[in-house]
Interface confidence: low
């Protein structure tokens, strides 16, 4: 649709509350270092301007694009050059180059202090004193730390955040009510951010064909009763929504997402029997519910795929007529029959099928050539099946913390050039796959595990792209989206790596260790473990286990001592010397 005033159109469609929230998120994701008050001021100015355009769409500047309006507003920030350096040069560009420039300067790892949670009473007072500001601050703090967070979903998180405070600040035991809810929102929020980051990376690095393929596979698993045409329509619409959000077009994205939810709820009969309970909910909750909806039951009478995709004499004719659509239909048919496969595996199978057709349709006897194509799938299917089986066995044997440590060692040996904080963060998250997926029934393990690993490895790729240090990581991250996980799995010990010189300072600990939370203690120990492996990449599991056991004993001993700092000062050098000897 063309509108005289895009800003008026979106304001009317979204309503003032969502409009203001989305503009705040957009600005916070672009200018991640700006103080809260500065963003609130900019948002209020944009909102007032939008209201003048609603009153008169012909008013001055109301016909400008949203990128022009928002970019002009961001470029008025007084401290742009000193705060953001070369990002200020974006303001010298014209649209659309200016917006592209802002997007390129989004920082996935901004230098911002970790969010500290105040006392419950302090938070409840702030909530009651000024609820609107309290919620805006939440949007701002999350958005600036997660510059690709799915904006309409962040509004849903903010609504849940508000509901938690509204309920718990009146409870007898405020903390018991509130803290578990905040923990849940934090964990879900981090997961949501990481999943969206993969969608944006898929679109930005591999193009919308890659994203559409992912969406065809995933939606076909979710909606196996839907016709291919219906799935195709949903894929096209979903691609538009995510392209907009990943491109910073948050108002259009939220508007189109609402339209998609409306369409799905109006067409439930031709999509899925599972949508009903989602469709009774209010907008934000409805969209979230639809995105997370469980897979519908598979139709009982699905015929074998071989007839249309192997045995038919028209395979090459159909493929040649419309390659992407034919492959799309193959992917749809395969995915709807295999909710037990990961999306990434399904995409690998479609790629293998495509490669076979490319080769065979040029052969003297195409049918003879591609007759055994399904046999070629077997090793592709078995590889993730075996990987999940082995890692779940290891997880069950070790427990989460030690499983994380095994992965830390494994990944540090593969890519020792990667920074220690990144290796710790990524390996800890890889290790969470155990608790998340290994308890599930067999049929759900692979889709859970491999698709989760894809999200975590994307985080490694995104961080590595900012500061590239390893050709192996670059290769695995850029060559093929669907083969990223197998590429990392296949990496061996990096023989070319020159071990890091021993630095006693890295292994010097103080009494503050004793006051850390269990999670923070684990991170300290895991940081030391990575540094050990970087120093001695060929150390055996037994050697590393011995050193880590000694470390745990040393910390426990000193944390029980009367003079903790003196104990660390005395026992620390002994621990270091013993560790060096053990690894010699």
């Amino acid at each position: 649709d063309t509108h005289k005033s895009e800003v008026a159109h979106r304001f009317k469609d979204l309503g003032e509350e969502h409009f203001k929230g989305l503009v705040l998120v957009a600005f916070s994701q672009y200018l991640q270092q700006c103080p809260f008050e500065e963003h609130v001021k900019l948002v209020n100015e944009v909102t007032e301007f939008a209201k003048t355009c609603v009153a008169d769409e012909s008013a001055e500047n109301c016909d400008k694009s949203l990128h022009t309006l928002f970019g002009d507003k961001l470029c008025t920030v007084a401290t742009l050059r000193e705060t953001y350096g070369e990002m200020a040069d974006c303001c010298a560009k014209q649209e659309p180059e200016r917006n592209e420039c802002f997007l390129q300067h989004k920082d996935d790892n901004p230098n911002l202090p970790p969010l500290v949670r105040p006392e419950v009473d302090v938070m409840c007072t702030a909530f009651h004193d000024n609820e609107a500001t309290f919620l805006k601050k939440y949007l701002y703090e999350v958005a600036r730390r997660h510059p690709y967070f799915y904006a309409p979903e962040l509004l849903f998180f903010a609504a849940r955040y508000k509901a938690a405070f509204a309920e718990c600040c009146q409870a007898a035991d405020k903390a018991a009510c509130l803290l578990p809810k905040l923990d849940e929102l934090r964990d879900e929020g981090k997961a949501s951010s990481a999943k969206q980051r993969l969608k944006c990376a898929s679109l930005q690095k591999f193009g919308d064909r890659a994203f559409k393929a992912w969406a065809v596979a995933r939606l076909s698993q979710k909606f196996p009763k839907a016709e291919f045409a219906e799935v195709s329509k949903l894929v096209t619409d979903l691609t538009k929504v995510h392209t907009e959000c990943c491109h910073g077009d948050l108002l259009e994205c939220a508007d189109d997402r609402a339209d998609l939810a409306k369409y799905m709820c109006e067409n439930q009969d031709s999509i899925s029997s599972k949508l009903k309970e989602c469709c009774d909910k209010p907008l934000l909750e409805k969209s979230h519910c639809l995105a997370e909806v469980e897979n519908d039951e598979m139709p009982a009478d699905l015929p074998s795929l071989a007839a249309d995709y192997v045995e038919s004499k028209d395979v090459c004719k159909n493929y040649a007529e419309a390659k992407d659509v034919f492959l799309g239909m193959f992917l749809y048919e395969y995915a709807r029959r295999h909710p037990d496969y990961s999306v990434m595996l399904l995409l690998r199978l479609a790629k293998a099928y495509e490669a076979t057709l490319e080769k065979c349709c040029a052969a003297a006897d195409p049918h003879e050539c591609y007759a055994k194509v399904f046999d070629e799938f077997q090793p592709l299917v078995e590889e993730p099946q075996n990987l999940v089986k082995q890692n779940c066995e290891l997880f069950e044997q070790l427990g989460e913390y030690k499983f994380q440590n095994a992965l830390l060692v494994r990944y540090t040996k593969k890519v020792p050039q990667v920074s220690t904080p990144t290796l710790v963060e990524v390996s800890r998250n890889l290790g969470k796959v155990g608790a998340k997926c290994c308890k599930l029934p067999e049929a759900k393990r692979m889709p859970c595990a491999e698709d989760y690993l894809s999200v975590v490895l994307n985080r490694l790729c995104v961080l590595h792209e900012k500061t590239p240090v390893s050709e192996k990581v670059t290769k695995c991250c850029t060559e093929s989206l669907v083969n990223r996980r197998p590429c990392f799995s296949a990496l061996e010990l990096d023989e070319a790596y020159v071990p890091k010189a021993f630095n006693a300072e890295t292994f010097t600990f103080h009494a503050d260790m004793c006051t850390l939370s269990e999670k923070e203690k684990q991170v300290k120990k895991q940081t030391a473990l990575v540094e050990l492996v970087k120093h001695k990449p060929k150390a055996t599991k037994e050697q590393l286990k011995g050193v880590m056991d000694n470390f745990a004993a040393f910390v426990e001993k000193c944390c029980k001592a009367d003079d903790k700092e003196a104990c660390f000062a005395e026992e620390g050098p002994k621990f270091v010397a013993a560790s060096q000897a053990a690894l010699a």
Partner: nanobody
Framework: QVQLVESGGGLVQPGGSLRLSCSAS????????MGWYRQAPGKGLELVAS???????HYADTVKGRFTISRDNSKNMVYLQMNSLEPEDTAVYYC?????????WGQGTQVTVSS
Amino acid sequence: QVQLVESGGGLVQPGGSLRLSCSASGSIWGIYHMGWYRQAPGKGLELVASITVDGSTHYADTVKGRFTISRDNSKNMVYLQMNSLEPEDTAVYYCDIRNVGGDYWGQGTQVTVSS
């Protein structure tokens, strides 16, 4: 690459009829939506009529009972039969076809209803 070409537009008197045609060339397989949109001078783009993969149709309130959309699957053609034309129907008419590959638009054909 898919190309859409509209034809059949022109000048017609109020109460008259026109039949618009839209043909698609290139790889356009697995179509799920075909539609006609129009844009009058100084106005936004509006949906006139659409037809889905299963043949179900949708019409704007302003054209119901006067316009009929149809398609020929074998030829990748979509038609718009316009009867009882009114001056308010004056606009550029665009054809839109959607498949898994994307959303494809024609260049438009001018329809002018005037005495």
